[in-house]
Interface confidence: medium
């Protein structure tokens, strides 16, 4: 059947439309297009004769129409008047006629809308505001947006005038937002610029800060007032009813008891004409003396001395308080308070007891703090550490060793090589070392105040060729699915590459395997029984390579769910019952049996001769692995028939 398709159906003014013909019959003589729903010579647009390929304009031809050999009609530069129906009249070679009608609609391209308002400064809880979307356009849909969201559902929001007008009744400060309107028709959509609604409100009841109402003589009084208000409020201060000043802040330096009284803040909004006030009562107290701490030992020795700290001055009927590291006193058997809390004794001080310590005297208003006191605890030296941790160096490099021991006062250091004193410095430096510099390097740390000294010895080997490495492990018996194991390739040597093999193969790619510390450390996370393999590390440098002996990881696992064999569950009376229990476990588990819940023997095999129906019941095998701390069990029902 002959049909007409309009592309597009909705056409914007000034654009073009194609009336596309479908199912055009064969053997045509020609065709004509007409404006309207029927063939009317007065409304012919154009005719076309196929034989001559001649197009002939009709009375309704506007010069904007183009006819194609396939009978489709293109209309350009569309105007509003073009809206409507178009009829195609087809004349076949046998002079039989056929007709089809199509249609399209024309819409204007919408202009960018704007918003007009009937009230630019509405007052909260009093005014209404009506926004209107301009211009008024026929066949247009109007939409509204608040803060780029569609309109919320609210009884205070009302759309009217075909949605062209948005009214906000009884505006609130929360209506201060960005408003946009949008016009839409089938061919265009345009959004307006934002209009910000400026709602006048307040002032709310002012708040005075800080909330503190008690002050000490000699302090500064600094009160600040704030009230939510649009436009911002103007502030006034009154003390005991007497006007002081028109500022947001009230500042009185070095107050005395005479400054006690009622302080009023008044907030005024000139646009809404409203006033609000808030009153606070300020009390000023006389100044007590500032406390201080005395100590019976200014340089106590760690693990030897006790220290008594006393809070001065002594005042009758006063509460004394103490703080360590800005915290209240921790519970500790080494901390003792006297009956009146004025003296704090530290028994057997440690280096962690340095403080700072503060004491306080409590009065009706506040707590007066002393200045902090820090204890100078003498300690150490601890065992010195020599860095770097390398034990192998290649010839020709510089050897630079540094020694450090925790100590107060700081330790004095001495270096010995193979027992011979070298120098009294914290660092030892030897340039361009050779094999002859191999030996025992001792660092001695001495604390002149405590008189204590400690030493650490490190073996240094100077060789271009690396030694046979060994593997150290942080966990010799890890538990499956629980523990991690870190293997470290020893020794630590400069300019050295570290390599690893598992069962003679290079490391597999696995998220549970991680190399760190310059590949010197291999960590296996969440070990499994399959990780019980031979691990080898290798070291190499410019002239040598060497491999460690294998280390086999002993992974503790299980017990898994046991299996009872044989699987038979039905027996004849008089037969022997011989049940064996097995569970995968490392180390081997301990086995025990229960029959109908009653404990039997602690063996892997349960044997009962010449069973009878009395032996019917549930047979449970229990397994436990003392190393992993895990247990497991299985239950089997046995039926004995007579």
């Amino acid at each position: 059947k002959l049909t007409i398709e309009s592309t597009p159906f909705n056409v914007a003014e000034g654009k073009e439309v194609l009336l596309l013909v479908h199912n055009l019959p064969q053997h045509l003589f020609g065709y004509s297009w007409y404006k309207g729903e029927r063939v009317d010579g007065n409304r012919q647009i154009i005719g076309y004769v196929i034989g001559t390929q001649q197009a002939t304009p009709g009375p309704a031809y506007s010069g904007r129409e183009i006819i194609y050999p396939n009978a489709s009609l293109l209309i350009q530069n569309i105007i509003q008047n073009d809206t409507g129906f178009y009829t195609l009249h087809v004349i076949k070679s046998d002079l039989v006629n056929e007709e089809a009608t199509g249609q399209f609609r024309v819409y204007p391209e919408l202009p960018k809308p704007s918003i007009s308002s009937n009230n630019s400064k509405p007052v909260e809880d009093k005014d209404a505001v009506a926004f209107t979307c301009e211009p008024e356009t026929q066949d247009a849909t109007y939409l509204w947006w608040v803060n780029n969201q569609s309109l919320p559902v609210s009884p205070r929001l009302q759309l009217s005038n075909g949605n062209r007008t948005l009214t906000l009744f009884n505006v609130t400060r929360n209506d201060t937002a960005s408003y946009k309107c949008e016009t839409q028709n089938p061919v265009s959509a345009r959004r307006s610029d934002s209009v910000i609604l400026n709602v006048l409100y307040g002032p709310d009841a002012p708040t005075i800060s800080p909330l503190n109402t008690s002050y000490r003589s000699g302090e500064n009084l600094n009160l600040s007032c704030h009230a939510a208000s649009n436009p911002p409020a103007q502030y006034s201060w009154f003390v005991n009813g007497t006007f002081q000043q028109s500022t947001q802040e009230l500042f009185i330096p070095n107050i005395t008891v005479n400054n006690s009284g009622s302080y009023t803040c008044q907030a005024h909004n000139s646009d809404t004409g409203l006033n609000r006030t808030t009153v606070t009562t300020i009390t000023v107290y006389a100044e007590p003396p500032k406390p201080f701490i005395t100590s019976n030992n200014s340089n106590p020795v760690e693990d030897e001395d006790a220290v008594a700290l006393t809070c001065e001055p002594e005042i009758q009927n006063t509460t004394y308080l103490w703080w360590v590291n800005n915290q209240s006193l921790p519970v500790s058997p080494r901390l003792q308070l006297s009956n009146d809390n004025r003296t704090l004794t530290l028994l057997s001080v440690t280096r962690n007891d340095v403080g700072p310590y503060e004491c306080g005297i409590q009065n009706e208003l506040s707590v007066d703090h002393s200045d902090p006191v820090i204890l100078n605890v003498l300690y150490g030296p601890d065992d010195p550490t020599i860095s770097p941790s390398y034990t192998y160096y290649r010839p020709g490099v510089n050897l630079s060793l540094s020694c450090h021991a925790a100590s107060n006062p700081p330790a004095q250091y001495s270096w010995l090589i193979d027992g011979n004193i070298q120098q009294h410095t914290q660092e030892l430096f030897i340039s361009n070392i050779t094999e002859k510099n191999s030996g025992l390097y001792t660092c001695q740390a001495n604390n002149s105040a405590s008189g204590h000294s400690r030493t650490t010895v490190k073996t240094i080997t100077v060789s271009a060729e690396l030694p046979k490495p060994s593997i150290s492990s942080n966990n010799s018996k890890p538990v499956e699915d629980k523990d991690a194991v870190a293997f470290t390739c020893e020794p630590e040597a400069q300019n050295t590459t570290y390599l690893w093999w598992v069962n003679g193969q290079s490391l597999p790619v696995s998220p549970r395997l991680q190399l760190s510390n310059g590949n010197r450390t291999l960590t296996l996370f969440n070990v499994t029984r399959n990780d019980a393999r031979a691990y080898v590390c290798g070291i190499q440098n410019s002239v040598s390579a060497n491999r460690s002996d294998p280390v086999t990881l002993d992974v503790l696992y299980g017990p898994d769910t046991p299996i009872i064999s044989p699987p038979d569950s039905s027996y004849l009376s008089g037969a022997n019952l011989n049940l064996s229990c097995h569970s995968a476990s490392n180390p081997s588990p301990q086995y025990s049996w229960r029959i109908n819940g009653i404990p039997q023997q602690h063996t892997q095999v349960l044997f009962i001769a010449k069973i009878t129906p009395n032996n019917n019941g549930t047979y449970a095998c229990f397994v436990s692995n003392l190393a992993t701390g895990r247990n497991n069990s299985i239950v089997k029902s046995i039926t004995v028939s007579a």
Epitope: P395, E465, P467, L499, Q540, S544
Partner: antibody, heavy 120, light 106 residues
Framework: QVKLEQSGAGVVKPGASVKLSCKAS????????MHWLRQGPGQRLEWIGW????????EYAPKFQGKATFTTDTSANTAYLGLSSLRPEDTAVYYC?????????????WGQGTLVTVSS | QNVLTQSPSSMSVSVGDRVTIACSAS?????MHWLQQKPGKSPKLLIY???NLASGVPSRFSGSGSGTDYSLTISSVQPEDAATYYC?????????FGGGTKLEIK
């Protein structure tokens, strides 16, 4: 297959300089150290030193300090030995040697050698 | 530098003989390595880290020793073993070689 191909033999005059090449195939020289050695007529092997092609670090035997210079062109996978101020006693076969273990075992690959003859 | 002295400097043996070559170091070393060089050829690694056979080396070759004294042994000499054998130390710079032991087969 690992192979080290050295440049051909040459005759040079005393006081002259020469640059020998060693082209590697079957491995990337950046993963190795390249050693250079020489062997005079009827003499023992002498180690000249090594270069790390990855960063250009070098180690020279004291005897060859100032005489030998190691360089590499990693894009050409080639190592070079420069010899300066040549004297008749520098007449020798010069070898390049990939002397670094790349696994748990030693792998020692040698070039075929280049004969340098110093003669007027 | 660490001087390596090999003995003997040359020897002539029959097929099937057991041969031992000694290498003495002027300073103690943790390991010794052995190379084999046939006339007109490049050296080839024979034994590394004192006693480990390099890839493809027959088991009749073995190495031992410690400190300053090391040795290479061929348990049953074969005609293809005719070559010069060098010991090498890699413990101190410069790396050094022995003077070589030339092995001839009668």
């Amino acid at each position: 297959q690992v192979k080290l191909e050295q440049s051909g033999a040459g005759v040079v005059k005393p006081g002259a300089s020469v640059k020998l090449s060693c082209k590697a195939s079957g491995f990337n020289i950046k993963d190795s150290y390249m050693h250079w050695l020489r062997q005079g007529p009827g003499q023992r092997l002498e180690w000249i030193g090594w270069i790390d092609p990855e960063n250009g670090d070098t180690e020279y035997a004291p005897k060859f300090q100032g005489k030998a210079t190691f360089t590499t062109d990693t894009s050409a996978n080639t190592a070079y030995l420069g010899l300066s101020s040549l004297r008749p006693e520098d007449t020798a076969v010069y070898y390049c040697n990939e002397g670094t273990p790349t696994g748990p075992y030693y792998f020692d690959y040698w070039g075929q050698g280049t004969l340098v003859t110093v003669s007027s | 530098q660490n001087v390596l002295t090999q003995s003997p400097s040359s020897m002539s043996v029959s097929v099937g003989d057991r041969v031992t070559i000694a290498c003495s170091a002027s300073s103690s070393v943790p390991y010794m390595h052995w190379l084999q060089q046939k006339p007109g050829k490049s050296p080839k690694l024979l034994i590394y880290l004192t006693s480990n056979l390099a890839s493809g080396v027959p088991s009749r070759f073995s190495g031992s020793g410690s400190g300053t004294d090391y040795s290479l042994t061929i348990s049953s000499v074969q005609p293809e073993d005719a070559a010069t054998y060098y010991c090498q130390q890699r413990s101190s710079y410069p790396l050094t070689f022995g003077g070589g032991t030339k092995l001839e087969i009668k």
